[in-house]
C-alpha cells in the first residue's frame, strides 16, 4: 500500500497561556525534498485552515509572520506550536502532510488532536 | 457563494491550441489546490492535471504531457489550461475543480466543452 | 497507477429500493482516500462522499459508504426519484489521480 500514514496525538491540554503543541509525524513512502503542513481545524462538519507552511527537507519549517502556528522539523517529524488559544478555539485539529516533490505526490492526514483550552480565570481583585 | 465558471471551449483542427479559463470566487483561492478533469462524450471522468497552491507545483496525466500547461493567477482568483497540439481524443467536456482540505473534489465547475476536428 | 474497478456498470432498480454500488481497487488504497461522486445527465459531477464513508455537506442521510483496503462499497438505502444517475469512485492519496469508469443507476 503506496499510502502516507500520518500520526499524532488524540489529545492535548493547552497551557494557561493559550499555547499547545503536539508532534505530527508521517511515513514517507517516497524520498520527498519539498513537503508541505497544514493544521486544520474540524468543527462539526465544517474543515478551516489554522496555518501551512512548506518546507524543503533539511530545511526549518517557516509559517507566515501572521501565522499562529510556528513548527519545527526534523526527518519524517514536525513539531507544531499553536499560540493564542482560548476556550471558544477547543476543538479537533488535524494534520495533513503532502509530498510536493519529486512526484508522486502523496497525500497524508492524520486523524486529529482533540486541543482542549481553558480561559485562565481572572485575577481577583487585592487591596494594598 | 462558493463556485468556480470555466470558459474558453470551442471547436478546432487537430495540432491547434485553445486556452481554457477557470474564474473561482467565495473562497480563498490560493489555500487551495485546483484540478481540470475532462469527460470525452459517453464515457467516464478522467483526471487531466493539477497546480497547487503558489502555483510551483504541477502535475499531469500522461496522455496531456508536453502538450497541456496548467497555470493559475492568484490575484485574479483565476486557474488556466493551455492546450497545444490538440488530437481528436481531447474532445471532452473539461471541468475544473477544488480539492478540498481532506483532498476530495469538493467544487466544480459547469464545464466547458472543447471540440476537436478537422 | 492505482485502477478503480467499478461493478455493475449498470444497476436497474425500482424508487425504494437499495441500491449496493461496488468499487475495487487494483492495490490497497487507505480509507482516508477514497470518494464517490454523483452525475446526472448535463451536469458537473457533485461529491457525496469522502474518506470513503463521510458525507459531503448537505448529502442526504440515505447515502453511505464503507469499505477498506481495495473493496469499497456506496450504498443508497431507498432510492428516490432524483438518485438516477451515474456514480463514480476515486482516489486522490496519491498521483495519477485516477476514478472508476462509473456505474448507472437507471430506473427498472
Known amino acids: 500500500c503506496k499510502a502516507m500514514h500520518v500520526a499524532q496525538p488524540a489529545v492535548v491540554l493547552a497551557s494557561s497561556r493559550g499555547i499547545a503543541s503536539f508532534v505530527c509525524e508521517y511515513a514517507s513512502p517516497g524520498k520527498a525534498t519539498e513537503v508541505r503542513v497544514t493544521v486544520l481545524r474540524q468543527a462539526d462538519s465544517q474543515v478551516t485552515e489554522v496555518c501551512a507552511a512548506t518546507y524543503m527537507m533539511g530545511n526549518e519549517l517557516t509559517f507566515l509572520d501572521d501565522s499562529i502556528c510556528t513548527g519545527t522539523s526534523s526527518g519524517n517529524q514536525v513539531n507544531l506550536t499553536i499560540q493564542g488559544l482560548r476556550a471558544m478555539d477547543t476543538g479537533l485539529y488535524i494534520c495533513k502532510v503532502e509530498l510536493m516533490y519529486p512526484p508522486p505526490y502523496y497525500l497524508g492526514i492524520g486523524n486529529g488532536t482533540q486541543i482542549y483550552v481553558i480561559d485562565p480565570e481572572p485575577c481577583p481583585d487585592s487591596d494594598f | 457563494q462558493v463556485q468556480l465558471v470555466e470558459s474558453g471551449g470551442g471547436v478546432v483542427q487537430p495540432g491547434r491550441s485553445l486556452r481554457l479559463s477557470c474564474a473561482a470566487s467565495g473562497f480563498t483561492f490560493s489555500s487551495y489546490g485546483m484540478h481540470w478533469v475532462r469527460q470525452a462524450p459517453g464515457k467516464g471522468l478522467e483526471w487531466v492535471a493539477v497546480i497547487w497552491y503558489d502555483g510551483r507545483n504541477k502535475y499531469y496525466a500522461d496522455p496531456v504531457k508536453g502538450r497541456f500547461t496548467i497555470s493559475r493567477d492568484n490575484s485574479k482568483n483565476t486557474l488556466y489550461l493551455q492546450m497545444n497540439s490538440l488530437r481528436d481524443e481531447d474532445t471532452a467536456v473539461y471541468y475544473c475543480a477544488r480539492a478540498g482540505y481532506l483532498g476530495a473534489f469538493d467544487i466544480w465547475g459547469q464545464g466547458t466543452m472543447v471540440t476537436v476536428s478537422s | 497507477e492505482i485502477v478503480l474497478t467499478q461493478s455493475p456498470g449498470t444497476l436497474s432498480l425500482s424508487p425504494g429500493e437499495r441500491a449496493t454500488l461496488s468499487c475495487r481497487a487494483s492495490q490497497s488504497v487507505s480509507s482516508s482516500y477514497l470518494a464517490w461522486y454523483q452525475q446526472k445527465p448535463g451536469q458537473a459531477p457533485r461529491l457525496l462522499i469522502y474518506?470513503?464513508?463521510s458525507r459531503a455537506t448537505g448529502i442526504p442521510d440515505r447515502f453511505s459508504g464503507s469499505g477498506s483496503g481495495t473493496d469499497f462499497t456506496l450504498t443508497i438505502s431507498r432510492l428516490e426519484p432524483e438518485d438516477f444517475a451515474v456514480y463514480y469512485c476515486q482516489q486522490y492519496g496519491s498521483s495519477p489521480w485516477t476514478f472508476g469508469q462509473g456505474t448507472k443507476v437507471e430506473i427498472k
Open positions: 474518506g470513503a464513508s
